[in-house]
Amino acid sequence: GSERTCCPVNWVEHERSCYWFSRSGKAWADADNYCRLEDAHLVVVTSWEEQKFVQHHIGPVNTWMGLHDQNGPWKWVDGTDYETGFKNWRPEQPDDWYGHGLGGGEDCAHFTDDGRWNDDVCQRPYRWVCETELDKASQEPPLL
């Protein structure tokens, strides 16, 4: 595939990445799949500046990111190391709360109304953000 040099239509460029901000809601797995079909991934927050950029665009709305602990430890969808990476949890979070009555705990992370993170039930239909790196090779065939 060819290397992407600019962002697709309706995506926003920031620091060599492209971002797409949904205006509807999906469960985390469906949001994850949506981004993958766009040759992207749910947003992975690696710095204070990226956090600020994303929260500016989403506003005070619960929004999925590419962080989950469905298989035990917290993991970023692109393989970025969680333990050594940027974190911005709300106080007392993540708490894997079981009291919601929906079965199980809370395995998926989202931005809250103040930008900080919370873990929640992955089935909740929140907005989401896709991210793709400009420097990575696109899966699309090159134009002839």
């Epitope: 600020k52 974190k87 106080p91 103040d114």
Partner: antibody, heavy 119, light 107 residues
């Protein structure tokens, strides 16, 4: 009401150390990021450092990196600034301030404590 | 580091005047621009955060605008208690740098 009270300032010789404290009350200290900001006599404001609500992350200005350490004790509702290898240019009023989530602005400030570095 | 500049560095105005102070960042800070008021011998007070949101208790004669690198603080009708020094601060990227300040005094 929100109250922040700094202490620990004074006159100190260059190269020596000092620890500032900021006692917080009137809000749930353990849920707020906190800042130190300083102001040299007759000069403008200079941001010094920020620490996450749980102490898990911290950032500081290049001018103090490796010399100053921001820390906190949530059980005592107290923020600290450990200042080592002090220089004359560190002479300033030091303010602690509460962080406003989302904007990272400082929404409440203490009255400040004066640090004078002089031989 | 992001550098912040303010203009003018000082201004004299009458009570009732409309006053505008500008602040420029050396790179894009999106909307993460805050304004503080400081009176002599006192701690600063937050006036406006994220460009245009008024902090609680701040009179509505204060307003902020801008985006990217250029921002402004406007006082629609200057009151005696508004004579002070005003600082802008970016909170997009650490270190959270301040502008050099604008002193507003009575003409």
């Amino acid at each position: 009401q929100v109250q922040l009270v700094e202490s620990g300032g004074g006159v100190v010789q260059p190269g020596r150390s000092l620890r500032l404290s900021c006692a917080a009350s009137g809000f749930t200290f353990s849920t707020y990021n906190m800042h130190w900001v300083r102001q040299a006599p007759g000069k403008g404001l200079e941001w010094v450092a920020v620490i996450w609500y749980d102490g898990s992350d911290r950032y500081s200005a290049d001018s103090v990196k490796g010399r100053f350490t921001i820390s906190r004790d949530n059980s005592k509702n107290t923020l600290y600034l450990q200042m080592n290898s002090l220089r004359a240019e560190d002479t300033a009023v030091y303010y602690c301030a509460r962080d406003r989530a989302y904007s990272s602005s400082s929404d409440f400030w203490g009255q400040g404590t004066l640090v004078t570095v002089s031989s | 580091d992001i550098q912040m500049t303010q203009s003018p560095s000082s201004l004299s105005a009458f009570v009732g005047d409309r006053v505008t102070i500008t602040c420029r960042a050396s790179q894009n800070i999106i909307s993460y621009l805050n304004w503080y008021q400081q009176k002599p011998g006192k701690a600063p007070n937050l006036m406006i955060y994220v460009t245009s949101s008024l902090h609680s208790g701040v009179p509505s004669r204060f307003s902020g605008s801008g985006s990217g690198t250029d921002f402004s603080l406007t006082i629609s009708s200057l009151q005696p208690e508004d004579f002070a020094t005003y600082y802008c601060q970016q909170s997009y990227s650490t270190p959270f740098t301040f502008g050099p300040g604008t002193k507003v005094d009575i003409k």
